[in-house]
């Protein structure tokens, strides 16, 4: 699990990098992370920390390694919380990435920095 509070990162710049990375991933036609499934989470309620807590359970997937890194930088929570998953709902990583991309774009357009 991720460790202590990371040093500060430039939020607008990091969000832009995350959008670029997620966009690249969604354009890749190969099955993402060999079809691994993750918990669907309420991004609006939990933000990048719950996204990280869900994606952190995906192992050995180079395609989302940079996404995991960026999310770790964006999530400055000291300790992981329980994933606020939608009851028993698992979705493919590819679907999760699409949802995360939409959320990040929305935040980038409207979020206060």
């Amino acid at each position: 699990a991720p460790g202590p509070v990371p040093r500060s990162v430039s939020l607008p710049l990091t969000l832009k990098e995350l959008i670029e990375e997620l966009s690249n991933i969604t354009q890749d036609q190969t099955p993402l992370c060999n079809g691994s499934m993750v918990w669907s989470v309420d991004l609006a309620a939990g933000g990048f920390c719950v996204a990280l807590e869900s994606l952190i359970n995906v192992s050995g997937c180079n395609a989302i390694y940079r996404t995991q890194r960026i999310l770790h930088g964006l999530c400055n929570r000291k300790a992981p919380t329980t994933v606020s998953s939608l009851p028993d709902t698992k979705i493919e990583v590819a679907h999760f990435i699409t949802k995360l991309l939409s959320y990040t774009k929305q935040l980038f357009r409207h979020g206060p920095f």
Epitope: P2, P6, T14, S36, G60, R69, H72, G73
Partner: antibody, heavy 118, light 111 residues
Framework: QVQLQESGPGLVAPSQSLSITCTVS????????VNWVRQPPGKGLEWLGM???????VYNSALKSRLNISKDSSKSQVFLKMSSLQSDDTARYYC????????????WGHGTSVTVSS | NIVLTQSPASLAVSLGQRATISCRAS??????????MHWYQQKPGQPPKLLIY???NLESGVPARFSGSGSRTDFTLTIDPVEADDAASYYC?????????FGGGTKLEIK
């Protein structure tokens, strides 16, 4: 509990090729990354390369032309092939796994000793 | 490639004292506010064992006598207090950039 075990030839003649197999138990290779690391007698560790669970392969740039890493996920085996061996390739060869982010090598095999000699 | 330089190459520390090992990277191993530097211990005849990940996080089961610190290019592994069982070689390793690289190692002797 993830376990890794290397098996190799022990002795290789100069200019010949080396083939080592790493058998992984306790985790599917579709979702597990395996590294190859070697250690010459009395010396330090040298990272050779790795294969990610999703198939991406990365090599040590200095050895790239001599290395080939592959896997058979159905048999839970990862393979290291190294060509044109010389005496300075004599080393203990380890496979090491990193399951989850941040992908530090948290599981190691015991290694297999390879001697290059005629 | 990122070159990791460890110092000293060897050191002897008295039982109960503090051991400090340094690892310097030829360029930053930080990414998005985290340091992708890890530390391993290797005892004679055994494979390496992960001690510390992401510069300062203790791997499960590793005694709290071990600690890691640092960022960007300068990192430190500290063992305090040193015990007889800590006689081993210690290696830093980065995975911020491919190819991954190891430091040259530091051999710790207990006096």
């Amino acid at each position: 509990q993830v376990q890794l075990q290397e098996s190799g030839p022990g002795l290789v003649a100069p200019s010949q090729s080396l083939s080592i197999t790493c058998t992984v138990s306790g985790f599917s290779l579709n979702a597990y990354s395996v590294n190859w690391v070697r250690q010459p007698p009395g010396k330090g560790l040298e990272w050779l390369g790795m294969i990610w669970g999703d198939g991406k392969i990365v090599y040590n740039s200095a050895l790239k032309s001599r290395l080939n890493i592959s896997k058979d996920s159905s048999k839970s085996q990862v393979f290291l092939k190294m060509s044109s061996l010389q005496s300075d390739d004599t080393a203990r060869y380890y496979c090491a796994g990193d399951g989850y982010y941040p992908y530090a090598m948290d599981n190691w095999g015991h290694g297999t000793s390879v001697t290059v000699s005629s | 490639n990122i070159v990791l330089t460890q110092s000293p190459a060897s050191l002897a520390v008295s039982l109960g004292q503090r051991a400090t090992i340094s690892c310097r990277a030829s360029k930053s191993v930080d990414s998005y506010g985290n340091s992708f530097m890890h530390w391993y211990q290797q005892k004679p005849g055994q494979p390496p064992k992960l001690l510390i990940y992401l510069a300062s996080n203790l791997e499960s089961g590793v005694p709290a006598r071990f600690s890691g610190s640092g960022s960007r290019t300068d990192f430190t592994l500290t063992i305090d207090p040193v015990e007889a069982d800590d006689a081993a070689s210690y290696y830093c390793q980065q995975n911020n950039e491919d190819p991954r690289t190891f430091g040259g190692g530091t051999k710790l002797e207990i006096k």
